[in-house]
Interface confidence: low
């Protein structure tokens, strides 16, 4: 996607977590929320659209409670002052999960997307364009927080003729680079620095009727399968990859494959067939020993919203899941530059892919 | 090589004010959580402060809460704590260290800096 | 804030001896619990991170389990290089805090 002006996603941030938005809510403008909910640590937690930091000024205010069976309440709070309350009696989330949580602000409401589907719709009670600031807390630990600014410009041709059976994400923009703002990412860590967040674009006709979003959309936004796309610059220390999606229910296994060449320099293979996250390189179409240890049980779940954040490192590559260090896998092939296509297939929908 | 490297710290009196650097090197300084932590003469470790200099997010414990500030260069990958209106309490061994992600505790430690506050 | 309560605050044991420390937290965790050694006059050093994950470099007499709240560090068979200061920290939610140390002393 081309992403001109929007800024860099929050990692890892703690919670309770204040942030800026920058340039401001805008129409079009996607919000992702990435995170797992907390087994027992209280009952609720929230995402705030707000004015500054006090908490005073909250345009809207979402947030899921684990109580009475479980519910959604949508608000909005001015000068101190919480207004009616409107609530959702089914609770998408579920405590101990990861989810997917999609924001898209339109020009009459927020749309909410839990795990690639739509949940509610929260109209606007306030002017939007005086939120600059996203909060989040509560029983939730965050993968991350990502942006995607609806300032796009088409790059290159949609796929087209891909089935697909449910909807993922927002419709999206188009592909293409994205300067990342002053000041956010660091000063010198390597050569090229640009971000490509990747969506699905093209095939008739949209769900959500939005002038700053191209014509030409999937129905049911999915991405292709498999999905390659380049890795712009390659691999190089301070490189983060982001990947989330949701495992298919009847899944056996899926890959996240970084490539160099036709090798793979780094293969991520869960298998659920034999409960185990499998990780090797093939150079030559051969294939080396297997990495298989894990300091806690299977984090992949059949049927379940998963998020994977691949950080490069000058010795390796260091993944997270769900929010949770995993492991580190030493490079095996070293001419980091080099790997620089990736490529994922296997029994999973993707919702959000940035490299 | 992985290096964190503290200084700053010296003998200050009550009210006044000192400023701690934590200079890393051998990592991609953005990409970790930068913690403070210090430890009183005979006594355990408390977390005082951190930051996530890629996004410059900052957190603080209450006890600091006011007085200090964490702050990072990424173009030097330094971290500093800026500590004003000390107070007798706030003497203790401060060093700095590293965390990966949101869940991985605390990898590397700098040797420390000992901060003493005292008319 | 989360407390996290260790015990004991000090044992005294002898080389080859098995040891085991616990913190137990006082609310929800997960597993985002380390495990640190701290020697007089030295920075800590990270054991085990996520409750139970060797932390590269670390001998594998140390290993840390998880039962719900309450975390636990073992020492297999204790080394004259084992004597320290041991802490527990969680990481979960702000702020991080740190177990009260146990102390581990030759009999």
């Known amino acids: 996607m081309a992403f001109s002006g929007s800024q860099a996603p929050y990692l890892s941030p703690a919670v309770p977590f204040s942030g800026t938005i920058q340039g401001g809510l805008q129409d079009g403008l996607q919000i992702t929320v990435n995170g797992t909910v907390l087994s027992s640590s209280g009952t609720r937690f929230a995402v705030n659209f707000q004015t500054g930091f006090s908490g005073n000024d909250i345009a809207f205010h979402f947030n899921p409670r684990f109580e009475d069976g479980g519910y959604v309440v949508c608000n909005t709070r001015q000068n101190g002052s919480w207004g009616p309350e409107e609530r959702k009696t089914h609770m998408p989330f579920q405590k101990g999960m990861p989810f997917d949580l999609c924001f898209l602000v339109q020009s009459s409401d927020f749309k909410v997307m839990v795990n690639g589907i739509l949940f509610v719709q929260y109209f606007h009670r306030v002017p939007f364009h005086r939120v600059d600031t996203i909060s989040v807390n509560g029983s939730v630990q965050l993968s991350y927080i990502s942006f995607q600014n609806p300032r796009t410009v088409p790059v290159q041709p949609a796929f087209s003729t891909v089935p697909f059976s449910q909807p993922v994400c927002f419709p999206p923009r188009p592909r293409g680079r994205r300067q990342k703002p002053p000041g956010v990412w660091p000063a010198n860590p390597a050569p090229i620095t640009q971000t490509v967040i990747h969506t699905v674009q093209s095939a008739p006709g949209q769900m959500f009727s939005t002038p700053a979003i191209p014509p030409m959309m999937y129905p049911h936004p999915a991405y292709p399968m498999p999905f390659i796309t380049t890795i712009l610059g390659g691999l190089y220390p301070s490189k983060s990859i982001l990947l989330s999606g949701t495992v298919l229910p009847s899944a056996q296994r899926f890959h996240i494959n970084l490539c160099s060449g036709n090798h793979i320099a780094f293969h991520l293979n869960p298998r659920f067939d034999e409960n185990a996250v499998v990780r090797n390189t093939q150079i030559d179409n051969s294939w080396g020993s297997e990495e298989r240890s894990l300091p806690r049980k299977m984090p992949f779940v059949r049927g379940q919203s998963f998020s994977v954040w691949i950080l490069c490192e000058a010795h390796c590559l260091k993944v997270a899941v769900d929010g949770q260090h995993l492991f580190e896998y030493y490079h095996r092939l070293r001419n980091l530059p080099t790997i620089n296509r990736l490529e994922v297939g296997g029994d999973i929908q993707l919702t959000h892919v940035q490299t | 090589e992985v290096q964190l490297v503290e200084s700053g710290g010296g003998l200050v009196q009550p009210g006044g004010s000192l400023r701690l650097s934590c200079a890393a090197s051998?990592?991609?300084?953005?990409?970790?959580?930068i913690h403070w932590v210090r430890q009183a003469p005979g006594k355990g470790l408390e977390w005082v402060a951190d930051?996530?200099?890629?996004?410059?997010?900052?957190y603080y414990a209450d006890s600091v809460k006011g007085r200090f500030t964490i702050s990072a260069d990424t173009s030097k990958n330094t971290a500093y704590l800026q500590m004003n209106s000390l107070r007798a309490e706030d003497t203790a061994v401060y060093y700095c260290?590293?965390?990966?992600?949101?869940?991985?505790?605390?990898?590397?430690w700098g040797q420390g800096t000992l901060v003493t506050v005292s008319s | 804030d989360i407390q996290m309560t260790q015990s004991p605050s000090s044992l005294s044991a002898s080389v080859g001896d098995r040891v085991t420390i616990t913190c137990r937290a006082s609310?929800?965790?997960?597993?985002?619990v380390a495990w640190y050694q701290q020697k007089p006059g030295k920075a800590p050093k990270l054991l085990i991170y996520?409750?139970?994950s060797l932390y590269s470099g670390v001998p594998s007499r140390f290993s840390g389990s998880r039962s719900g709240t309450d975390f636990t560090l073992t020492i297999s068979s204790l080394q004259p290089e084992d004597f320290a200061t041991y802490y527990c920290?969680?990481?979960?939610?702000?702020?991080?805090?740190f177990g009260q140390g146990t102390k581990v002393e030759i009999k």
């Open positions: 260290a590293r965390g990966w992600y949101a869940a991985y505790g605390m990898d590397y």
């Open positions: 051998g990592f991609t300084f953005s990409y970790y959580w």
């Open positions: 930051i996530y200099p890629s996004s410059g997010y900052t």
């Open positions: 609310q929800s965790v997960s597993s985002a």
């Open positions: 996520s409750a139970s």
């Open positions: 920290q969680q990481y979960a939610l702000r702020p991080l805090t």
